[in-house]
Amino acid sequence: GSVKVLHEPSCFSDYISTSVCQWKMDHPTNCSAELRLSYQLDFMGSENHTCVPENREDSVCVCSMPIDDAVEADVYQLDLWAGQQLLWSGSFQPSKHVKPRTPGNLTVHPNISHTWLLMWTNPYPTENHLHSELTYMVNVSNDNDPEDFKVYNVTYMGPTLRLAASTLKSGASYSARVRAWAQTYNSTWSDWSPSTTWLNYYEPWEQHLGLNDIFEAQKIEWHEHHHHHHHH
């Protein structure tokens, strides 16, 4: 039977080395055996290149194309072939379809003043345009309570987030994951990073104190209160 594309290719670029296109065929297809995606930069002297697609699902194909460090002017001509039959033809501008790389190495460290310090790595080298353009979303969720989750938007430069332990349930196990996007490129969100898990062992301040400590604290409080009035 004839080969047909049900959903035409949708492509995204990580804006550094790879563009990925995905499409759906109208019936289960052995993508690597039956199809080829040719791509060529619209640029003087550029050669035609061929990508061999892989199956993501029975009828969904995906092709990863190595590209040079992308620049805004780059436009690729894409042609999807089944043998000698041209199934689809289109163009793709990586700078207009950015999906950032996934942030890496998410770690959680205890920090001063009952806070957790979440750190991750910017997935781009400093010389890449996207390095300074990324903002992040951090999702923190209670492993045993689906209702207990928080989302933090990190819009400043550093790939870190300080989290007050008091905002989380004491003794509960929490997981965090992070994703990135590039606002100036109107990008989509990156994939989520792998989760990292930790135990929130924070206890409210008064629970850490013995009776004597509480008594001393009350004495200090009384003394300060009395001293304050004495000056009036």
Partner: antibody, heavy 125, light 112 residues
């Protein structure tokens, strides 16, 4: 040492044909686009044609489109320019030159970095 | 097509002085930051052209640092400092952003 040697230039009558050759040495020929540029007597430089490293992409000046064909034999490290339906205004010295590196996705450009010595084509009755 | 206009068409300079040649393109030659597809070539009398500057400001291999290229977009300049007798010839700018490649008319440099 990178070197280009052109040959094939001659005196030919209008409407005639000629094939120019350019033999390359000293670099990986197949990795680079190659270009022909010509210079009419006492005039400036004029681009004629360019071919990508694999030979898969060709480009022509409007003045020669449909009459000239650029090709290459990467096994022989040789660039060709087949010139048909020649006219008096095609009279010029023809130079071949090394153009951009085309084995990368976006070709890397270093200018027309090396030029041949040129071969003279004269079209006259 | 992109039209390249060179000025002046001829130039006479004393040895040791600085020569400047301008080249204007009818369209921007900037493809991406730092990548202006504009070259400068020198053709000495009776010789083949030789590359001096590519991508607007990068010196070709073996070219002395007396030769420098500057500019971006549509306006470019070739400067030759401490001019020598050996610098005589015709200087051409050329755009290589897209086909057809186009050359300026050429500037004839004469050493006094």
């Amino acid at each position: 040492e990178v070197q280009l040697v052109e040959s094939g230039g001659d005196l030919v009558k209008p409407g005639g044909s000629l094939r120019l050759s350019c033999v390359a040495s000293g670099f990986t020929f197949r990795d680079y686009a190659m270009t022909w540029v010509r210079q009419a007597p006492g005039k400036g430089l004029q681009w004629v044609s360019t071919i990508s490293g694999s030979g898969g992409k060709t480009y022509y000046a409007d003045a020669v489109k449909g009459r000239f064909t650029i090709s290459r034999d990467n096994a022989k490290n040789t660039l060709y320019l087949q010139m048909n339906s020649l006219r008096a205004e095609d009279t010029a010295v023809y130079y071949c030159a090394v153009d951009r590196l085309t084995k990368t996705i976006r070709p890397q450009y270093y200018g027309l970095s090396v030029w041949g010595q040129g071969t003279l084509v004269t079209v006259s009755s | 097509d992109i039209v390249m206009t060179q000025t002046p068409l001829s130039l006479s300079v004393s040895p040791g002085e600085t020569a400047s040649i301008s080249c204007r393109a009818s369209q921007s030659l900037l493809y991406s930051i730092g990548y202006n597809y504009l070259d400068w070539y020198l053709q000495k009398p009776g010789q083949s052209p030789q590359g001096l500057i590519y991508l607007g400001s990068k010196r070709a291999s073996g070219v002395p640092d007396r030769f420098s290229g500057s500019g971006s977009g549509t306006d470019f300049t070739l400067r030759i400092s401490r001019v020598e007798a050996n610098d005589t010839g015709v200087y051409y700018c050329m755009q290589a952003l897209r086909d057809p490649y186009t050359f300026g008319q050429g500037t004839k440099l004469e050493i006094k």
